[in-house]
């Protein structure tokens, strides 16, 4: 039996700059029941606070709701582990909510097969930013990727589309069913999960319909 090992905060993420969660790895428990607490202060303040919500984001986590989240201040966060034999603390972690955004995936992914005047067909992929993202005001600047593959294939073909919410894919195989997904990343943030798959079958022969 021994004091607990040093915990480590390994991840902090915000879906929208309005709330965020930090998760920690507990470290060894020293063979004894061990309690964990997360404490934090904000830049320029001496007051230390305890985690407002240990439950919402699951085990070994702290959720900061809107009421506790500010993009104007750096959070200095520490996790403390305590058992009957002693205690240990993680290194202090500095968190700027602006830089931990991992948004929800883009939505409304639509696939349309189109034809150029020269009869060349292409797939027109369109999507919308995630619901929570206030892209229009510049609060978020999003970059996007799409990926697609024939249904039976292993490898995805990835296209970076920049800030565009549409993309044209040429040279696809006629008669093949393609799966398509999209994801987004804010400036200075993290890629979202890939969206749900949408699928489309490229026609063998294509008659232009107006």
């Amino acid at each position: 039996q021994s004091p607990p090992g040093k915990p480590e905060i390994h991840k902090c993420r915000s879906p929208d700059k309005e709330t965020f969660t930090c998760w920690w790895n507990p470290g060894t428990d020293g063979g004894l029941p061990t309690n964990y607490s997360l404490t934090y202060s904000k830049e320029g303040e001496k007051t230390t606070y305890e985690c407002p919500d240990y439950k919402t984001s699951g085990p070994n986590s702290c959720f900061f709701s809107k009421q506790y989240t500010s993009i104007w201040k750096i959070y200095i966060i520490t996790v403390n582990a305590t058992n009957q034999m002693g205690s240990s603390s993680s290194d202090p972690l500095y968190v700027d909510v602006t830089y931990i955004v991992e948004p929800e995936p883009p939505r409304n992914l639509t696939l349309e097969v189109k034809q150029l005047k020269d009869k060349k067909t292409y797939l027109w992929v369109k999507w919308s930013p995630p619901t929570i993202t206030d892209v229009k005001t510049g609060w978020f600047t999003m970059e996007y990727e799409i990926r697609l593959k024939p249904e039976e294939a292993e490898e995805w073909e990835i296209h970076f589309t920049g800030h565009q919410t549409q993309f044209k894919v040429f040279d696809l195989y006629p008669g093949q069913k393609y799966l398509v997904q999209t994801r987004c990343k804010p400036d200075h943030g993290y890629w979202s999960r890939w969206s749900q798959e949408s699928s489309v079958e490229m026609p063998n022969d294509f008659t232009l319909k107006d």
């Epitope: 480590e8 390994h10 991840k11 902090c12 790895n25 830049e43 320029g44 993009i71 104007w72 750096i74 290194d91 972690l93 500095y94 968190v95 700027d96 602006t98 830089y99 931990i100 510049g138 990343k185 200075h188 993290y190 890629w191």
Partner: antibody, heavy 118, light 112 residues
Amino acid sequence: QVQLQQPGAELVMPGTSVKLSCKASGYTFTSYWIHWVKQRPGQGLEWIGEIDPSDSYTNYNQKFKGKATLTVDRSSSTAYMQLSSLTSEDSAVYYCGRSFFTNWFAYWGQGTLVTVSA
Amino acid sequence: DVVMTQTPLSLPVSLGDQASISCRSSQSLVHSNGNTYLHWYLQKPGQSPKLLIYKVSNRFSGVPDRFSGSGSGTDFTLKINRVEAEDLGVYFCSQSTHVPFTFGSGTKLEIK
């Protein structure tokens, strides 16, 4: 404790390439961005770029695009920077640095002195 | 790119004196999120730089309170009260509001 270990020096021929390493320890490697900074003798610091070890996403200073390539090896918790087509202008100390969940960095390696000379 | 201009280039001081270093940016360092990402580093001879101050005025963990930062917009100052021998080295200001991040050319704090 957090450590970023870099080799002390590399002597390389003009026109060749060099791959600098930065081995991270004391924390979860994939959690935090790694930055690279150049310092020429007796001069200021230049930010080269950054890489997110979790997915190898990179941001570069335009000035170093085509000169520097940032990569990571997650299995060994090591970040790399390859410098290509070396000239005497590339002779410098190169530092790796680690951010928190912030856009500034507080942990630095000891730096690798690259000397380009025939 | 944002140009960071530091003055003076060299600052001779006596131990116990106050030192003041100025840093001016070629454009405002106020980020679209309202924060100002201006930081100060100290590089001692033969060492890598160490963070002293982040976001204009916040001392990093373990930095003595004789170091203080101030300023806004494009004009910033680092003050060192009662300079000690261990404070000698080159001080750099740095901005991370705009990509690419940029640094000042450095101010060498040395004994008179």
